[in-house]
């Protein structure tokens, strides 16, 4: 015989769930024991069956989960999973906060990415910091020239997608450019999007030729000697 224990504690590390109103929330407390334990749920310390909740709840005992769809502010609270068998019991608390902020287009931190100057052969990092209520995704674009033109017949710039990523809100997204060459010079755009829309911010990368070893602070004219 064995008292209940968590089988996947790493899946329970996110204690605070702050979600926009209308979203679906799923709490899981995967457990095991001998005999096989049972699970029940409490809300703010009281037995919770969801009878007073519009849309009710879904309890999936085989998945050790509680699912609430279309959460509203009254769903805020502490949700406790209580797992027990004849030998013992364990419990875990989740905190649910329902956000009523107006979700907006992603906001990109001013000044990022920043105009940057680098020397051929060096490494460059372009930064983009995104603020978004909804889960944002990011693209790094490089503006390119096709047939001598930067813009298509439709008036939009030609771009090459360098990187696409889903990120957490307020995370800094970095574009690494290794061993830059003159061809890497140009305009780079950080595009951030969410369910409301897209936002853009651009910066220029200037790439200078490799420094001449004869060029020193003491003898700037040396560069031009024969």
């Amino acid at each position: 015989q064995q008292a209940p224990y968590w089988t996947h504690p790493q899946r329970m590390e996110k204690k605070l769930h702050a979600v926009p109103a209308g979203n679906t929330v799923k709490f899981r407390c995967p457990a095991a024991g001998n005999p096989t334990p049972t699970i029940r749920w409490l809300k703010d310390g009281q037995a919770f069956h969801g009878e007073n909740r519009i849309g009710g709840i879904r309890l999936r005992h085989q998945h050790w989960s509680l699912v609430m769809e279309s959460v509203v502010p009254s769903d805020r609270g502490t949700y406790t999973c209580l797992v027990e068998n004849a030998v013992g019991s364990i419990r875990y608390n989740y905190l649910l906060d329902v956000l009523e902020r107006s979700p907006h287009r992603p906001i990109l931190q001013a000044g990022l990415p920043a105009n940057t100057t680098a020397v051929v052969g060096s490494d460059v990092e372009l930064l983009c910091k995104v603020y978004s209520d909804a889960q944002p995704h990011i693209q790094w674009l490089k503006h390119i020239v096709i047939n001598g033109s930067s813009f298509g017949a439709d008036g939009f710039p030609y771009v090459q997608v360098l990187k696409t990523a889903d990120i957490n809100s307020s995370e800094v997204e970095v574009l690494y450019l290794r061993n830059v060459s003159a061809e890497d010079a140009g305009e780079y755009t950080c595009l951030a999007g969410n369910s409301i829309g897209l936002s853009y911010q651009s910066a220029w990368l200037t790439v200078l030729p490799e420094e001449d070893p004869t060029w020193t602070a003491a003898a700037p004219e040396a560069r031009y000697t024969d």
Epitope: G22, H104, I107, H137, N194, S195, I196
Partner: antibody, heavy 124, light 112 residues
Framework: EVQLLESGGGVVQPGRSLRLSCAAS????????MHWVRQAPGKGLEWVAV????????YYADSVKGRFTISRDNSKNTLSLQMNSLRVEDTAIYYC?????????????????WGQGTMVTVSS | DIVMTQTPLSLSVTPGQPASISCKSS???????????VYWYVQKSGQPPQLLIY???NRFSGVPDRFSGSGSRTDFTLKISRVEAEDVGVYYC?????????FGGGTKVEIK
């Protein structure tokens, strides 16, 4: 051709439920957020809900919060709106609208493609 | 929520003459990325709305150049330089900066 086609409208009594669907074609549905917008007879336009490209984020107008649920099935290129506890004031044409894409677009980032709409009448 | 207030309620225009519709938002629609997220639509009888102008002043593909959008922050204008019979319909402005997305009440354009 990019197209959105709504279905599922009809006449229903107050308090009952209805499920609307929107079939998308001509674009990569799974790369776009999708919206529902409604228009009461002879009235203006009212935004109802949005769902992100992967279904992970959903937002609703206060007037439908807790009663309507937006969902999507990217494998079937289908957007849905489950409408519960319907009220007389939910009577409207419901339009499915394409939202922002997952990345760079040469043009507007959404609200460019609308379906023809499906009529929902809530009446006792 | 951002309130979009449209004027006038209706407009009767002689073909070939200009027309102007105003839209005011309760908050600035100028985003941190420098773009102003106001859209303009026309809805013709029995049809869904059709996009005319996006991001304040960009004409959507296929929209005649007699349509133009202008303004800044909270005050926006849709202009039709020379109204044609096919321009009859209800015109709406919309803010596309945050949810809930909101529309103006509409301006009905008729031909004299």
């Amino acid at each position: 051709e990019v197209q959105l086609l709504e279905s599922g409208g009809g006449v229903v009594q107050p308090g009952r439920s209805l499920r609307l669907s929107c079939a998308a074609s001509g674009f990569t549905f799974s790369s776009y957020a999708m919206h529902w917008v409604r228009q009461a007879p002879g009235k203006g336009l009212e935004w109802v809900a949005v769902i992100s490209y992967d279904g992970s984020n959903k937002y609703y107008a206060d007037s439908v919060k807790g009663r309507f649920t937006i969902s999507r099935d990217n494998s079937k290129n289908t957007l849905s709106l489950q409408m519960n506890s319907l009220r007389v004031e939910d009577t409207a044409i419901y339009y499915c609208v394409r939202g922002a894409g997952r990345g760079y677009t040469r043009g507007p980032d959404g609200f460019d493609i609308w379906g023809q709409g499906t009529m929902v009448t809530v009446s006792s | 929520d951002i309130v979009m207030t449209q004027t006038p309620l209706s407009l009767s225009v002689t073909p070939g003459q200009p027309a102007s519709i105003s839209c005011k938002s309760s908050r600035s629609l100028l985003h941190s990325d420098g773009k102003t997220y106001v859209y303009w639509y026309v809805q013709k009888s029995g049809q869904p709305p059709q996009l005319l102008i996006y991001e304040l002043s960009n004409r959507f593909s296929g929209v005649p150049d007699r349509f133009s959008g202008s303004g800044s922050r909270t005050d926006f204008t849709l202009k039709i330089s020379r109204v044609e019979a096919e321009d009859v319909g209800v015109y709406y402005c919309m803010q596309y900066i945050e949810a809930p997305l909101t529309f103006g009440g509409g301006t009905k354009v008729e031909i004299k």
